[in-house]
Every structure is written in C-alpha cells, then in structure tokens.
C-alpha cells in the first residue's frame, strides 16, 4: 500500500468548516477524518468546495463505507451526489422519501441523469411499489417520469397513485404504457360523476377499449380532437358515425382537418359513405352505398 502523506502540524480538522476550502487536495486527504466527515456531512453542502476537493471527500467516504453509504450520510450528500456513479448508488438502501427529495433537489432543472434514474430505481424497488407520495415527488421533479417506465414497471403502480398524475405527466407515454395505466385510472376514478370522471380520465384514454368509448359517447362528454387523435386506432374503428358524433359533440367538425391522419383516416375507410355524409363535413373515402361489409375477424372466430 502506498504510504499516505502525514497531516502537517496544526492542520488536523476538528470539524468540517470553511477553513477546509483552503486546504490542498493532499491536505484534505491527510487531515480530514472520514468518520468526522460522515457525521458532519450536512455541512459540506454549505461550504463552496471545488469539484477536485469533493472528489477527495467522496474518496474518504468510499473508504469508510465500501459496502455503500448509510442513509444518514446519503441524506446530506448535497452536491456530492453529482459525483456518485450509478455503481455507487446501486450499493445504497434508500428508504426515506425525504432522502430522495433531498437528492432530487440537487439535480433539479437538469435532465434525468443515469445517477438519478438508478436512485429512483433503487428507491422504488425498495418500497415494492410506486406509491402515491413517491409518484407525487417524482412527477414534480420529472413530469415525464411515468412515461419513462416500462409497461411491466407501470404494473406496480397502485390505482390510488393515479390521483397524483397530471395530464402533462402522460404527454410522452406510448399506447403500450397507456394500456397499463388506463384500467388503473378507470378504477381510481370509478366513483366520480360523469363530467368530473371525464375530466380525470381524459388523459388516460389512449389506453381505452372500444366498449368504454361507446359508453362515453352516451354521456355528452364533448371530447376534443387532440384527445380523439390519441385514441387507439383499433378502439376507434368499430365506433359508428353516430357514436363518434356523440363522443365529439361540437368538436366533430374537426374531423375534416384530420381526415388524412390516423385514427380518423382508418375510421373513415370503415364507415358507409352515406353515414359519413350525414355529418355534413364532406368526409370522403367511406364504403360506397350498396357494398357489403364482411367482418373477417368474426368469420375467423367462427371457423
């Protein structure tokens, strides 16, 4: 082992204080006791250490806790957290939401780093599920967090946590993710009345099946075109012209502007032209009058 440089006389640190910002890296290494550092971690964040000095402090903690830092230290890491690697973080056992918040605060305003992603993963796995308080915290710091999870990971979100989700939290979710979240949202909001229910469920409708869309069409919900365009194509296709008209209400005229885009384009192709004509929007591409429509999926099921 390399012989360590001795601490110069009179420079041994008795506490973590601002005098240490004037220590050279080797002096910090030699004169700061790791155990003292661990017990006074909460001071480190208040002292403007250089990145090089923070490297030394991290090294001292790594030597003291080779199996991973205790939560009492983790909670007060502050800017030292930015020095941690995902490998370091995988050794941690973070159970307190306050600790999670303290570390997310350090990274606030930045993209989710690999360190933060690892920290969140460790935290959620430790809790066993993504509870409401955790989800509240994570989406407050990272609105796109929910949509970064796999469908498998989303399956651990309890319906009660759905109340914490804001529309913007779902902006980047794909249909596979919404397929998992929608049934949870339906369950979470089931006791609400019609208009209130629609306001809450609207953001999740990209995962709704046909029968739920049919049911909504009977409730005068006036779905806007932006929401309609996010619906699953396979859920929209079986809807009749009358059902779409009821579903969209006054927004139905927006179909004309979207007639070349999915799911409107595919839906038009499935409707009788004379039914489309009843909308008075000039939608073209429907099935000409007199043609027989075979439902091949039904035929396959019977054979």
């Amino acid at each position: 082992e390399v012989e360590k440089t001795a601490c110069p006389s009179g420079k041994k640190a008795r506490e973590i204080d601002e005098s240490l910002i004037f220590y050279k890296k080797w002096e910090l290494e030699a004169c700061v006791d790791a155990a003292l550092l661990a017990t006074q971690m909460d001071r480190v964040n208040a002292i403007p250490f250089t990145y090089e000095q923070l490297d030394v402090l991290k090294h001292k903690l790594d030597e003291l806790y080779p199996q991973g830092y205790p939560e009492s230290v983790i909670q007060h890491l502050g800017y030292l957290f930015l020095k941690m690697s995902p490998e370091d973080i995988r050794k941690w056992n973070v159970t307190s939401l306050e600790t999670l918040k303290a570390l997310l605060e350090v990274n606030k305003g930045h993209e989710m780093s690999p360190q933060v992603a690892t920290l969140i993963d460790r935290f959620v796995k430790g809790r066993g599920q993504l509870d409401k308080d955790t989800l509240d915290t994570l989406t407050a710091f990272y609105p796109g967090y929910l949509c970064s999870l796999s469908p498998e990971e989303l399956s651990s979100v309890p319906p009660s946590s759905i109340w914490a989700v804001r529309p913007q939290d779902l902006d980047t979710c794909d249909p596979r993710q919404l397929d998992v979240l929608y049934p949870k949202a339906r369950l979470a909001f089931q006791n609400m009345n019609g208009s209130e229910y629609f306001v809450k469920i609207q953001s999740f409708l990209g995962g709704a099946p046909t029968e739920d869309l049919k049911a909504l069409s009977q409730q005068n919900v006036s779905m806007d075109l932006a929401t309609f365009m996010k619906l699953r194509t396979d859920a929209v296709l079986p809807l009749t012209v009358a059902e779409v008209q009821k579903l969209l209400g006054p927004h139905v005229e927006g179909l004309k502007a979207e007639e070349r885009h999915r799911p409107v384009r595919d839906w038009i192709l499935r409707q009788r032209q004379d039914d489309l004509d009843t909308l008075g929007l000039g939608l073209q591409g429907g099935i000409p009058n007199g043609y027989l429509v075979l439902d091949l999926s039904m035929q396959e099921a019977l054979s």
Epitope: G10, E18, F22, D42, A46, I47, P48
Partner: antibody, heavy 116, light 110 residues
C-alpha cells in the same frame, strides 16, 4: 479561548491614511481566512475585505477597492488593513473577524473618524 | 441600499415567536450559505446561525435558521427581554466576489 484585538484607529483628515492591526490568539491563525467589517455610526454592518490563509487572493468591497489593502503575517498571528485616501464616509467602527463566509469570532472594534 | 433585504423592525411580547426574513438573489443566498448575527446595544456582533441552520455552541435553541431558494429566515421562539437587539443576515455573493449583509432588523420586546 479565541481572541481578536484591533488597534490603530483614530482621527484622521480626509485624504489621509491609517493602518489597522488585528492580533489573533486562541486558534491556528494560519489555517483560517480573515475579514474586516465596518459599521458607520447608527448604521448597519458593511463587509470591507477578506483574505485567505495563504494571502493568495484578496477580496474587497467596491466602496474601498483601490484605496484599502488587506494583508496578514501568519508568523505574528496578525491581520492588517492599510487605508489610504480616506473619506468622511469611511468613518466607522472597524471589526476584524475570523473566517470569510461566516464570521464566528469578532474583535471589539476600533473607531476610525475621518474629519477635517 | 443593502444587497440582502430585511424588514427594518420586528417586535413581540415575551414568550412569543418572532420571524425575520432575508431576501437575496441566486448569486448570494441562492448559491451560498446564510449566517445570522446578533448585535446587542453597544457591543460587537455575535454569530447566531451559520451554514443556514447551524447554531454555534452557547447559542440557545430558541434561535433557528432556515433557507429556501433565494430567501432565508431567522426565528426566535420564546422571546425574552435579552433578545432585544439588531439582527443581520449575511452571505457570500458569487457575482460581487464579496460578502453581503442585510440592512439589519431591530427586534423590540414589548
């Protein structure tokens, strides 16, 4: 016990000079940054200058930059403030204080009066 | 005009809780530690709170400090007559490359 003792204050005419000293004891002087803070009669605190342990860089308030010079002698455990081109608005009690980010010990102060 | 803003005065009756605010900017309180100083009439200032919320030994736990964003506050609970003094907040300012104080708050015990 930490002690800071300022000296060198007094009455001086506008344009004149003074040199303040601060003798430190009870701590390892050479490990700590030191500062000067002043307080005009009936007014609040105003930071004047700061100096790190090795005198490497020196910091000054805009109001005194170019006129005041801070220095230290670690072998004598003493902090200095050389004040030139003094103005009436420099009249104040001058305190020396330990550290540069949180002043944990203060001297009792020395009064500097600039008047004709 | 001070870089850090404090109310000029605050008051309370014995036993009450008094809070003093200190507002700065991203270059001082927003990115550096805040300290609070107490100055009793006719004496030198004394450090009351450092590193935002730490108390030096000998300072009663009736005094507490906190910081959030670009603001800080000092709370005195269980106000006593001996707490009648001027209180100053201070912080390093990274833009000015110097230390800045608030204008001070005179606390009166009614």
């Amino acid at each position: 016990e930490v002690q800071l003792l300022e000296s060198g204050g007094g009455l001086v005419q506008p344009g004149g000079s003074l040199r303040l000293s601060c003798a430190a004891s009870g701590f390892t002087f050479s490990n700590y940054a030191m500062s000067w803070v002043r307080q005009a009669p009936g007014k609040g605190l105003e930071w004047v200058s700061g100096i790190p342990p090795d005198s490497g860089s020196k910091y000054y308030a805009d109001s005194v930059r170019g006129r005041f010079t801070v220095s230290r002698d670690n072998s004598k455990n003493t902090l200095y403030l050389q004040m030139n081109s003094l103005r009436a608005e420099d009249t104040a009690v001058y305190y020396c204080a330990k550290n540069m980010l949180s002043f944990d010990y203060w001297g009792q102060g020395t009064l500097v009066t600039v008047s004709s | 005009q001070s870089v850090l803003t404090q109310p000029p005065s605050a008051s309370g009756t014995p036993g009450q809780r008094v809070t003093i605010s200190c507002t700065g900017s991203s270059s001082n309180i927003g990115s550096n530690a805040v300290s609070w100083y107490q100055q009793l009439p006719g004496t030198a200032p004394k450090l009351l709170i450092y590193y935002n919320s730490k108390r030096p030994s000998g300072v009663p736990d009736r005094f507490s400090g906190s910081k959030s964003g670009t603001s800080a506050s000092l709370a005195i609970s269980g106000l006593r007559s001996e707490d009648e003094a001027d209180y100053y907040c201070g912080s390093w300012d990274s833009s000015l490359n110097g230390y800045v104080f608030g204008g001070g708050t005179k606390v009166t015990v009614l």
